[in-house]
Interface confidence: low
């Protein structure tokens, strides 16, 4: 060993005076002369190109060219390689360390607030984490020791820029403006793309990204790449940011972030972002199931391990709150799974954003932008082939859960594409094969990862999936700052935290209700309605008296039909009253002359056959509602396309008489004939099926008015603008929220624990063309249509101005989890 030492370049690199055993040299020219010592390459050359320590490097003489140091003074000089302590000083590495060593919070002096690191690995689909866990020891350790969700839902379209910016603003793409990686804004008359400088124009970027939220509240923020971080949003950049350069090695990115953590307290950021292009790049190139992706996962895992090791070296591994997530997933595409517009149009005289989330607009912009006939394009693309692999939509008709309509950059024609398919202009597009993303955010292949670890997070926990709009509020809570207004629901991720920072409370009711009182059993105005079955005033008086409930009857109906409390009205100045019936309760909106909501509980019926028809052609005035606030039966004669539907289905009756409680004008809502067919099938068949499977369901349903398609209830004047010749406003959508007990041994009204929800928001359209139902029985398309328009309870609340579940005895944060839950039925990945 002594000889070896004498012939070694250890601590002698580039020392021109050194002569080793047999006169070997370690100077810069030794290679040319051929007299280098045996370890010159490993010790002096290779060590300057690596980010790690090894037995050759420990105690090395400091080399200027080194990326990081393993010299004995590197801790003092703060330039050690991330693994110096574990390799050179024998400390346990972060990877080998036991989970349990994390105490409450282990922050060194000067770290009063645990820093937050937001780390994105582009295109890391959730399934990778389970399939390739053994190949990713560092990320898998984070998953084991910290908290993770089964997956995190990306926003639509499941693209890089929209989702990265959603994560840091809590806003939907329609709200923050980055609605795709490529887009046109007619007001700016400019095109945005990832390859043009235009992407750095602040006019594209709305909302308040996390770095600004932190900075506005006295904290510093550093971004090592993040979409938007190089843009002067609201006139400001992050405190520290790096101009995007995809060729910067991951280790260099990590090393720089660790250096930022070494800054003096006054200069040190509290919020950091880190972005890796992988595994997205490899996923595009080879598809999600490929050797390239496996290799990329090992690369990002190694770099992530370097970060954790570097944190441990600084004693920050149990101080920093780190969130590791992705923007979206990845799916395989095929060159034989292409839809070409040339198969649908003789001539392509429009501009198409091609791929998994296509949009179509005028070719000639801005000149033809507003005059472009989007309706005609959708008509020409609807129900054209039996095996069509996309559905065309006008954006206001897209499922409301997507929140993808209210922005001038979102072109009016949208194609919702089947998994693994691409829609393009013509066969000249050969951009296929490999992987892609952008698809429906319910597809399992589009699911992203979410893992978190740190003093604020629970340990060794798996949580239910949630949406990436919720991450911004979570990060604000970690930094103990106030979030800017956003689309997330603050408090809905409190279950991720050991000690929640923000305790939500139920919204306060804005418009108080009254009770529509019963005065006279005979109406002062029959509202042009007829019910031949009620042949005289005595019979009419008898059925109307059924509407005059005693206090005991009111208490009973509330217990059964409003088991979680009356929906609270959060709209301003809404004159509304409660109408109690034995089998349902409704909230009547006087200005709209129709029920705002109706609530009833369908028990588990022994018989699951469809409900019988009700007494035909029987409608009458509700004696509790003044004629001036009621619809008239004559309204429905004026527009032959519109008929009336019932919010509470009269056929769901416990006695033959009780159907008369539902055959009243206050239970009526305007419906297109074609829509009503679907509505009636849902209530007579599917609802009974759900009630049977779930031991009863509570149903709350009602109309929605969202003419300006912004995902929020319309102001009264907005609705008034759209009243046609019928004098009654026509809803743009109808909602149905089904609630049952998660523990199916309990009925909804006696549910002690968690609830199960199934909310739908169905566009109210004059035709059912969305389902291509021609020649098909309802059984083949209605359920699929409802499922396509599944939503969150929160989406219903925003569209109606109602607030649900206020009387459910459960912490508000748990109620918010329920309200932000999106049921999914996807099984294929």
């Amino acid at each position: 060993r002594k000889l070896e030492k004498q012939g070694s370049c250890r601590k002698k690199c580039f020392d021109a005076s050194f002569r080793g055993l047999e006169n070997c040299r370690c100077d810069v020219a030794c290679k040319d002369r051929g007299d280098c010592c045996w370890d010159f390459e490993d010790t002096c050359v290779a060590s300057t190109r690596i980010w790690t320590c090894n037995k050759f490097r420990c105690g090395e003489t400091r080399l200027e060219a080194s990326l990081c140091s393993c010299s004995d003074d590197c801790l003092q000089r703060k330039d050690c390689c991330a693994d110096y302590k574990s390799v050179c000083q024998g400390e346990t590495s972060w990877l080998e360390e036991n989970c349990d060593t994390a105490q409450q919070s282990q922050c060194p002096e000067g770290f009063d607030l645990p820093p937050v690191i937001l780390f994105s690995m582009d295109g890391f689909r959730a399934e990778y984490l389970y399939t390739w866990d053994t190949l990713m020891p560092n990320i898998n350790k984070l998953k084991t020791c910290g908290i993770h969700s089964k997956y995190m839902r990306a926003m639509y379209p499941t693209k890089t820029f929209p989702n990265h910016y959603t994560i840091v603003t809590g806003l939907y793409p329609e709200s923050h403006g980055i609605i795709d990686n490529n887009m046109y804004d007619v007001n700016l008359n400019k095109n945005f793309s990832l390859s043009s400088e235009e992407q750095n124009n602040p006019a594209w970027w709305h909302g308040q990204p996390m770095w600004l939220t932190a900075m506005y509240q006295g904290l510093k923020a550093a971004t090592y790449f993040w979409p938007g971080s190089e843009v002067a949003i609201n006139g400001s950049f992050p405190s520290i940011y790096m101009p995007y350069n995809r060729s910067v090695p991951y280790e260099e990115r990590i090393s720089t972030l660790l250096k930022w953590l070494d800054l003096p307290k006054a200069e040190r950021p509290s919020f950091y972002t880190m972005y890796f292009e992988e595994p997205d790049s490899s996923g595009h190139a080879g598809g999600p199931v490929s050797a390239r992706v496996i290799k990329a996962l090992q690369v990002v895992d190694h770099a992530f391990g370097m970060l954790m090791e570097g944190l441990k070296q600084r004693n920050l591994h149990n101080c920093v709150n780190i969130i590791l997530l992705a923007d979206h997933g990845m799916d395989q595409t095929y060159c034989n799974k292409m839809e070409y517009m040339t198969d649908y149009f003789p001539r392509i005289n429009f501009y198409m954003y091609e791929g998994p989330a296509p949009r179509i607009r005028a070719f000639n912009v801005p000149h033809d932008f507003f005059s472009f006939n989007s309706e005609e394009i959708v008509r020409n693309l609807s129900c054209r082939k039996p095996d069509q692999h996309f559905k065309p939509y006008l954006t206001p008709d897209l499922p409301k859960r997507l929140h993808y309509a209210k922005n001038v950059r979102i072109d009016k024609v949208h194609l919702f594409v089947d998994r693994q398919w691409l829609a393009v202009g013509s066969k000249s597009n050969t951009n296929c094969g490999g992987g892609n993303h952008g698809y429906n955010n319910e597809f399992r292949s589009m699911e992203a990862i979410f893992l978190a670890h740190g003093p604020s997070f629970k340990e060794k926990t798996e949580v239910e999936p949630f949406e990436n709009i919720e991450v911004y509020n979570l990060m604000c809570d970690l930094l103990r700052i106030q979030p800017a207004p956003n689309n997330g629901t603050r408090g809905s991720l409190n279950h991720l935290l050991k000690v929640p920072f923000y305790e939500p409370s139920h919204a306060e009711e804005v418009s108080k209700f009254s009770v529509c009182g019963f005065a006279n059993p005979l109406p002062t105005d029959n509202l042009s309605c007829l019910c031949p079955h009620l042949q005289n005033s005595i019979q009419l008086e008898q059925v109307n008296q059924m509407l005059n409930l005693t206090q005991e009857e009111i208490t009973a109906t509330v217990k059964v039909n409003l088991p979680f409390g009356r929906p609270r009205v959060l709209q301003k100045n809404v004159d509304n009253c409660l109408l109690y019936h034995r089998e349902y309760v409704s909230g009547f909106g006087k200005a709209m002359r129709m029920p705002m909501w109706s609530s009833y509980t369908v028990p588990q019926l022994g018989d699951t056959s469809p409900l019988p028809p009700t007494v035909p052609d029987c409608l009458r005035a509700d004696v509790r509602v003044p004629p001036s606030e009621s619809q008239k039966c004559s309204f429905y004669l004026a527009d032959e396309n519109i008929t009336h539907g019932f919010l509470y289905p009269p056929a769901i009756n416990r006695t033959s008489d009780s159907q008369y409680d539902a055959l009243i004008m206050s239970n009526l809502v305007p419906m297109y004939e074609e829509f009503r067919k679907m509505w009636d099938y849902f209530h007579s068949v599917l609802l009974i099926k759900h009630a049977t499977e779930r031991n009863g369901v509570n149903v709350v349903s009602g109309p929605i008015f969202d003419y300006n398609y912004d995902g929020h209830f319309d102001a009264p004047e907005e609705i008034t603008k759209h009243i046609a010749n019928t004098d009654i406003p026509i809803p743009t959508h109808y909602f149905v929220v089904l609630t049952s007990c998660k523990n199916k041994s309990h009925t909804p009204e006696n549910c002690p624990g968690w609830l199960d929800v199934l909310p739908f928001i169905i566009p109210h359209r004059p035709t059912n063309v969305e389902s291509c139902p021609e020649g098909k029985p309802e059984a083949l398309w209605v359920e699929e249509r409802f499922t396509a328009h599944i939503a969150r309870v929160r989406d219903v609340e925003l569209l109606t101005g109602l607030d649900f579940y206020q009387d459910k005895a459960q912490p508000v944060s748990e109620i918010l989890q329920l309200k932000t839950y999106l049921p999914t039925f996807e099984t294929t990945i």
Partner: antibody
Framework: EVQLVQSGAEVKKPGESLKISCKGS????????IGWVRQMPGKGLEWMGE????????RYSPSFQGQVTISADKSISTAYLQWSSLKASDTAMYYC????????????WGQGTTVTVSS | DIQMTQSPSSLSASVGDRVTITCRAS??????LAWFQQKPGKAPKSLIY???SLQSGVPSRFSGSGSGTDFTLTISSLQPEDFATYYC?????????FGGGTKVEIK
């Protein structure tokens, strides 16, 4: 651009009546509450009351209830503050302000109307 | 009625200083608080709503924080145009009430 433009300065004698106005533009006037705020010379701001022009629903501060009347004419996008019998203590600057549609905070203010009551 | 107490009632500061004004509510008002700036002879101008959200067009040197009963308005680096009187106002319950104001003067 959202704007509230108030009527000009008024000089009145005690006991006289007065109606000052606040005209909104650049937004749907009927959809936002309009509030009135008093500022006596050298003093702070006092909330008097507000009106929802859509249905003329009003709310008053107990200190001003019965002293003033708030009204609105949504057809001409104008809100009013009126006195049936002025007192010297009504001498002040009066501001109208729009309440934000979502947050209820006063986001846009009129330029103010000076009312001087002196014999 | 909810009383809003502002402190200090006046302060002297120099350009570039960090200035903090506090506002205390006599009972919890969640984050239903706004801050206004008023210059002599001018109408108040909205700076912050919902305790911490910046009105559009307001410079980022202004920030608000707090919830419940204690609130703060911070000017991170005072500019010449910031010398004015600042008011807080609660809009959690009726009647709406303002703080007494804080006059920021040139030192």
């Amino acid at each position: 651009e959202v704007q509230l433009v108030q009527s000009g300065a008024e000089v009145k004698k005690p006991g006289e009546s007065l109606k000052i106005s606040c005209k909104g533009s650049g937004y749907r006037f009927a959809s936002n509450w309009i509030g009135w705020v008093r500022q006596m010379p050298g003093k702070g701001l006092e909330w008097m009351g507000e009106i929802y022009p859509g249905d003329s629903n009003t709310r008053y501060s107990p200190s001003f209830q019965g002293q003033v009347t708030i009204s609105a004419d949504k057809s001409i996008s104008t809100a009013y503050l009126q006195w049936s019998s002025l007192k010297a203590s009504d001498t002040a600057m009066y501001y109208c302000a729009r309440k934000d549609y979502y947050y209820y905070a006063m986001d846009v203010w009129g330029q103010g109307t000076t009312v001087t009551v002196s014999s | 009625d909810i009383q809003m107490t502002q402190s200090p009632s006046s302060l002297s500061a120099s350009v570039g200083d960090r200035v903090t004004i506090t506002c205390r509510a006599s009972q919890g008002i969640r984050t239903n608080l706004a801050w206004f700036q008023q210059k002599p002879g001018k109408a108040p101008k909205s700076l912050i709503y919902a305790a911490s959200s910046l009105q559009s067009g307001v410079p980022s040197r202004f920030s608000g924080s707090g919830s419940g009963t204690d609130f703060t308005l911070t000017i991170s680096s005072l500019q010449p145009e910031d010398f004015a009187t600042y008011y807080c106002q609660q809009y959690n319950s009726y009647p709406r009430t303002f703080g007494g104001g804080t006059k920021v003067e040139i030192k």
